[in-house]
Each structure stands twice: as structure tokens, then as C-alpha cells.
Interface confidence: low
């Protein structure tokens, strides 16, 4: 680390003094000051003097000597006072510019230590500080406005007592820039927009910033509109604002309008699309399938997709039957808003029932008349199956119906002993029905069709099973022949019941 | 059955712009919103943005404003995205994915593209 | 902006048995009754794909295994029983408030 002699950290001198300041280090050594007149500087290797013969108050201030090839970029510093009765400030800087919330410097120092007592900062003709400035002082570097705000971008004197009365500074300019984190926030409303050729609409682009420099403008397509702009400041943050009134709009209004604004920190900008159409429009669609099946006892969303202009009056969910009078909950039903032209509409049927099979219409109005969609909604069913022993042209025949959802498909087991249900150990036939008689096929009603079996003996230790299945599950009726005549027995596993 | 074919791999200077494109078939192309998803290698995915092609409407994550264009072309079925300035943050796969009105999920994606950012 | 916390970050789990991946979002939503919930499997090279959407409805083709639940702020993917075909990265997404964002991811390995 240099050394500076004398060794003292403060010297007090009078006007027209002569001051010698030495520094010597290990290397080269380099002085570091105020700008001020009458210094000499000697270099001489590893020492450097610092000389005048006329001290000046100007030549007050901090010293300090640096060793350049010192890796430790160590220093010492010395600070001289030049004691001036009729000065006692050395201002080095008349402006001083700093960001909002930084301390800020009003770099006014002291000629003569003994005045420190008696130091004030003022506002320029003697006017108070603002309210809330926080401030100190340090006779070596002048006063610091604490964490400084753009209000407090004012000027400013130092004012010592000497004698009993104020003695000031000249004046130093204190600029506040505010911090612009970026460039300005942007607003463009709405942010779509659809009218009917002839009708009034409004678009507003706004712009806000802590700053006052920043443009703003709204562009339709690529060219820039003359529109009048209105300025307004609150919350702190001054406001600019296009409004685009058009009173009767045309298809050439159409298209995409940008709102753009800039300041130092950079461009934002924000696009909306205007459409201009003949009439209004209504238009129902869907990203489902308008014929829906489901097994019974699971649910359904039904969802309908609107895109309207202008907005719809009316809308509802109606059950068009077959089976029951019933109209869906509105509680069963929901809406949501994409924007303001779009929209989703959603039914919600859970664990649907037998009589909730059928078509279900969403119907929507607005000044471009109604709409509707409808969903044909068909359940399905397991098989249910029961078999009866009667003579068809008089011969013995096994009679066995089965109803479900989709058509079921038919097969018929002989087996020995007398059981539930046919194991394959105990299988001696087996016949498939590929083509059952069809006995109802109504819209949204289960299929029942008729498998018939001709039986020339029934044997009585034996079982006769009709099994039926769909692709939703099976059913079956074990037909046992006992002496007494036909016994059936349907396994409770397989009854079905919704 | 729903499609979308995106364009091959891009390798790309800095400061470059690129465009992708992402085809869509097998439904009503003007119905249904086609998003933007960006994946970094080895991590998560970020919504970058959406275009509606029944007008070209577009809605973007404000991360990705003025870094990203969305635009459409109905009459080849066509949606693009436009990156500008690229830096290395932009090298990663880009998806294109399809999603019906509001809440609906993003039930078909494209293959991705891979966009390499280097000098 | 909605954030989506997803846990655990990986986990292992054995063959046939129950894995269970959690989504915290940081506020609550629930739009006109519906929540903007879904949820993708990833595996690498290839775009998500959709398995659970709106909370719990099992996307089209996907298998049973696979279920959602929760609401609010709170939601879980179940795989009962975990499959080999399973390992991938399983996401969380939010489509009720812009912008639509998605979880961190959960790396599923089996042991």
C-alpha cells in the first residue's frame, strides 16, 4: 500500500499556502483528485509529489494515491482544507443526475472543518427542503439526499454559518430520472372486434409509462392513423390514449389494428382483428360425433361450440323425446366464454337411465335467427335372456329371447347333468344363431331377438343354455328338463337389472 | 383421422429468423385453435401461443411476445410460426397442437420440430 | 400466471402396482363449474399425448388404468396397475387462465 506524507489524514492550510503532498509505494504510483488549478506533479520512480505554491479553496478536496501494479489495489488518501473565510464551499459539480431511489451526491465540500456545525442544505432562494427528504453530510464529500425521488429534482445550495450568519454555495441542479424498466404497458380494446356493415364501433389504443418520453400510435394494416391523442397522469404513471370512433364501418374498415408504443427502453405492441360482416351470423358446431352411444348407468358431456354476432338472446337445452316429457337441469348445463364472439356449451348427463335415451337439442337465438344441433343420444344394454319349452308344427323346440344393446348374438349349449350355467367339461354341443329373428328394432330402444332351438327328445339329465352377448356384456338361461315337466332357472348372476 | 405434419429440422445462425409450418387434415381446419408448445431439450413444455384460423386471431403467452408470429394459410391448410432474433434459449423442439374452444385439451399433436440455434 | 407444482420430480415403482403423481396449482380454479385440468404422458422423441382431460374424464382410447381427480387447486393422476409401457414423463396442464401452462413434469421408472 503507498504512503502519502504527511502522514496525517486531514490538512488544514490558509489561501495562498504552499502544499507539498508526496506518495511513495513499492512501483509507480499515480494521484487522484479534485479538478483544481495550480497543482504541479513531480514523478520520480516509485514516488510522485503533488505541489502548489498558491492554495486556493478550490484546491479543497480528497487525494488519493494508487499503485497501478499493486494486485491488492490498495490506496491511501489525504484530505486538504483550504481554509477561505469569505468561501467556505468548493463545489465540484453544478448537476448531478441519478435514478430514482439511488443516493444521490451534491458533491459540496467544506473549506474549513470547524464550520461542520453549522451546515444546512436548502432549496435555491432559501426555500425549505421537501417534506420527507432524508439526508446527511460528510464535510469530506458534501451532502447525500437519501434514496432520492424524481419530485425532489430540484436545485440546491449548502448554506455554513460563519459569523453568525448563512453563507451559501453556488447553486447544484439535482435531476431524478425515473427508472423505466421497460418500454411503455400497452392496452388495445377490444381485443377482437366484429360489427355488421353501417354500425358504430370504437377502438382504444393506451399506453402508460413512469416516464413522460414515449410515443404512441395505431396502425390499421400497416398504415398509421391520425388520430388525436389525450394525456392523462395518475397512479403515478402518465397515460396516452388513441380512441378510434368509427360511425358507420365499412368492409374497408376490416382488418388487423396494432397499438404500438416506444420509449428508450424499446417497442411493445399489441394486434386485434376487426371483422366487418354483411348480416349477423349464428353458427352451432360441434367437435363430437351428433350420434353418441353409451352404456347405461355411465354419463355424457354433450358440448356445442357458438360463434354469434351480435350476442345471443336466448338459449336452451330441450329433450325431444322418446321416452319421457323430462327436460334436461339447467343445472346440468354450463357455459363458457372464449371471447367475446365464441362461446361452449356444455350438457352434463350423468348416469344416464332408460328414459334418458333419445335426441337432445341445443337451440340458440340471436337477431340472425335461431339455431339448433341435435344429438341422438342411444344407450346400451347387456343381453337379458329367458327361454321357454313350447311345440312349433309339433315339434319340441327351445324358444329363447334376448334383449339388448347392440343386437346380442345367440349361442346354444347341451351339457350333462343339471347346472347354472355350462362349464366346458361339461359341453357335448354346441350350436351358434347367426341370423336370430329380429322381434323389435326400435330408434333408442334395445333389440330383442328369437333364437329357436328344436329339440326331438329332451334329455332329463341333461341342460339345455342360451347364452346371448353384446359388446357391452352377456346374459344366459340354463333350461333343466325334469320328469315333471320343463324347468328353467336363470342364474341370478346373470339377470340384469338397470 | 386428424393430422399435422410440421416441417423438418432447422439449423440456424444467431440473430437469424426461421419459420415452421404445421399442416392440418382430417377435420374442419377453421374450427379448431392450433397452439404452439415449446420443449427445451430434456425439459418441461411452455405454451408459446395460439392462431384461430376461422381469422387469423392469435393469442400469446406474453413471454413470447414479439418473439414469436403466428399466422395461417386457409387455402393450404396451413399454420406458421415465425421466431426472430434467435438466440441459443430458442434451440428446442417446437409442437404444434390442436384444441377446440375454451378449456379444451390439446388432444392432437404434430411429430415436432427441431430448431437449432448455433454458429 | 398460473403455476402448476408437480411431485414427486421421478419415482419408481414396481410392476402391477399403484403409481400416483400429484399437481398443486397456486391459485384456485373452477370455471362455471368445469375444471381446466389435463394431463399427458410423454416418452422421449415423441409429442404428449392426452390421457385424463377436465380433472377426470379418460381421454378416448386410453386405458382404464389411467384416472384423475381433484379440483381447486389440487389434482392426481392414478395408473393402477402400472404397466412396462407406462415409463414416461407425465405432465399437468391448465387451460383456465392465460397463460395455459403446465407442470414441471414426473419421470415414472419401473424397478
Known amino acids: 500500500i503507498p504512503v502519502i506524507e504527511p502522514s496525517v489524514p486531514e490538512l488544514v492550510v490558509k489561501p495562498g499556502a504552499t502544499v507539498t503532498l508526496r506518495c511513495v509505494g513499492n512501483g509507480s504510483v499515480e494521484w487522484d483528485g479534485p479538478p483544481s488549478p495550480h497543482w504541479t506533479l513531480y514523478s520520480d520512480g516509485s514516488s510522485s509529489i503533488l505541489s502548489t505554491n498558491n492554495a486556493t479553496f478550490q484546491n479543497t478536496g480528497t487525494y488519493r494515491c494508487t499503485e497501478p501494479g499493486d494486485p491488492l489495489g490498495g490506496s491511501a488518501a489525504i484530505h486538504l482544507y483550504v481554509k477561505d473565510p469569505a468561501r467556505p464551499w468548493n463545489v465540484l459539480a453544478q448537476e448531478v443526475v441519478v435514478f430514482e431511489d439511488q443516493d444521490a451526491l451534491l458533491p459540496c465540500l467544506l473549506t474549513d472543518p470547524v464550520l461542520e456545525a453549522g451546515v444546512s442544505l436548502v432549496r435555491v432562494r432559501g426555500r425549505p427542503l421537501m417534506r420527507h427528504t432524508n439526508y446527511s453530510f460528510s464535510p469530506w464529500h458534501g451532502f447525500t439526499i437519501h434514496r432520492a425521488k424524481f419530485i425532489q429534482s430540484q436545485d440546491y445550495q449548502c448554506s455554513a454559518l460563519m459569523g453568525g450568519r448563512k453563507v451559501m454555495s453556488i447553486s447544484i441542479r439535482l435531476k431524478v430520472q425515473k427508472v423505466i424498466p421497460g418500454p411503455p404497458a400497452l392496452t388495445l380494446v377490444p381485443a377482437e372486434l366484429v360489427r355488421i356493415r353501417g354500425e358504430a364501433a370504437q377502438i382504444v389504443c393506451s399506453a402508460s409509462s413512469v416516464d413522460v418520453n414515449f410515443d404512441v400510435f395505431l396502425q390499421h394494416n400497416n398504415t398509421k392513423l391520425a388520430i388525436p391523442q389525450q394525456s392523462d397522469f395518475h397512479n403515478n404513471r402518465y397515460q396516452k390514449v388513441l380512441t378510434l370512433n368509427l360511425d358507420q364501418v365499412d368492409f374497408q374498415h376490416a382488418g388487423n389494428y396494432s397499438c404500438v408504443a416506444s420509449n428508450v427502453q424499446g417497442k411493445h405492441s399489441t394486434s386485434m382483428f376487426f371483422r366487418v360482416v354483411e348480416s349477423a351470423y349464428l353458427n352451432l358446431s360441434s367437435e363430437q360425433n351428433l350420434i353418441q352411444e353409451v352404456t347405461v348407468g355411465e354419463g355424457l358431456n354433450l358440448k356445442v361450440m357458438v360463434e354469434a354476432y351480435p350476442g345471443l338472446q336466448g338459449f336452451n337445452w330441450t329433450y325431444l323425446g322418446p321416452f319421457s316429457d323430462h327436460q334436461p337441469e339447467p343445472k346440468l348445463a354450463n357455459a363458457t366464454t372464449k371471447d367475446t364472439y365464441r362461446h361452449t356449451f356444455t350438457l352434463s348427463l350423468p348416469r344416464l337411465k332408460p328414459s334418458e335415451a333419445g335426441r337432445y337439442s341445443f337451440l340458440a337465438r340471436n337477431p340472425g335467427g335461431w339455431r339448433a344441433l341435435t344429438f341422438e343420444l342411444t344407450l346400451r344394454y347387456p343381453p337379458e335372456v329367458s327361454v321357454i319349452w313350447t311345440f312349433i308344427n309339433g315339434s319340441g323346440t327351445l324358444l329363447c329371447a334376448a334383449s339388448g344393446y347392440p343386437q346380442p348374438n345367440v349361442t346354444w349349449l347341451q351339457c350333462s347333468g343339471h347346472t347354472d350355467r355350462c362349464d366346458e367339461a361339461q359341453v357335448l354341443q354346441v350350436w351358434d344363431d347367426p341370423y336370430p329373428e329380429v322381434l323389435s328394432q326400435e330408434p333408442f330402444h334395445k333389440v330383442t331377438v328369437q333364437s329357436l332351438l328344436t329339440v326331438e327328445t329332451l334329455e332329463h339329465n341333461q341342460t339345455y343354455e342360451c347364452r346371448a352377448h353384446n359388446s357391452v356384456g352377456s346374459g344366459s338361461w340354463a333350461f333343466i328338463p325334469i320328469s315333471a315337466g320343463a324347468h328353467t332357472h336363470p342364474p341370478d348372476e346373470f339377470l340384469f337389472t338397470p | 383421422q386428424v393430422q399435422l405434419q410440421q416441417s423438418g429440422p432447422e439449423l440456424v445462425k444467431p440473430g437469424a429468423s426461421v419459420k415452421l409450418s404445421c399442416k392440418a387434415s382430417?377435420?374442419?381446419?377453421?374450427?379448431?385453435?392450433i397452439n404452439w408448445v415449446k420443449q427445451r431439450p430434456g425439459q418441461g413444455l411452455e405454451w408459446i401461443g395460439w392462431?384461430?384460423?376461422?381469422?387469423?386471431?392469435?393469442k400469446y403467452n406474453e413471454k413470447f411476445k414479439g418473439k414469436a408470429t403466428l399466422t395461417v394459410d386457409t387455402s393450404s391448410r396451413t399454420v406458421y410460426m415465425e421466431f426472430h432474433s434467435l438466440t441459443s434459449e430458442d434451440s428446442a423442439v417446437y409442437f404444434c397442437?390442436?384444441?377446440?374452444?375454451?378449456?379444451?385439451?390439446?388432444?392432437?399433436w404434430g411429430q415436432g420440430t427441431l430448431v437449432t440455434v448455433s454458429a | 400466471k398460473i403455476v402448476l407444482t408437480q411431485s414427486p420430480a421421478s419415482l419408481a415403482v414396481s410392476l402391477r402396482q399403484r403409481a400416483t403423481i400429484s399437481c398443486r396449482a397456486s391459485?384456485?380454479?373452477?370455471?362455471?363449474?368445469?375444471?381446466?385440468m389435463h394431463w399427458f404422458q410423454q416418452k422421449s422423441g415423441q409429442p404428449p399425448k392426452l390421457l385424463i382431460y377436465?380433472?377426470?374424464n379418460l381421454e378416448s382410447g386410453v386405458p382404464a388404468r389411467f384416472s384423475g381427480s381433484g379440483s381447486r387447486t389440487d389434482f392426481t393422476l392414478t395408473i393402477d396397475p402400472v404397466e412396462a409401457d407406462d415409463a414416461a414423463t407425465y405432465y399437468c396442464?391448465?387451460?383456465?387462465?392465460?397463460?395455459?401452462?403446465f407442470g414441471s413434469g414426473t419421470k415414472l421408472e419401473l424397478k
Open positions: 391459485e384456485s380454479f373452477d370455471s362455471y363449474g368445469n375444471t381446466f
Open positions: 382430417g377435420y374442419t381446419f377453421t374450427t379448431y385453435d
Open positions: 392462431v384461430y384460423p376461422r381469422d387469423g386471431s392469435t
Open positions: 397442437a390442436r384444441s377446440g374452444l375454451t378449456g379444451s385439451p390439446f388432444a392432437y
Open positions: 396442464q391448465q387451460n383456465n387462465e392465460y397463460p395455459l401452462t
Open positions: 377436465r380433472a377426470s
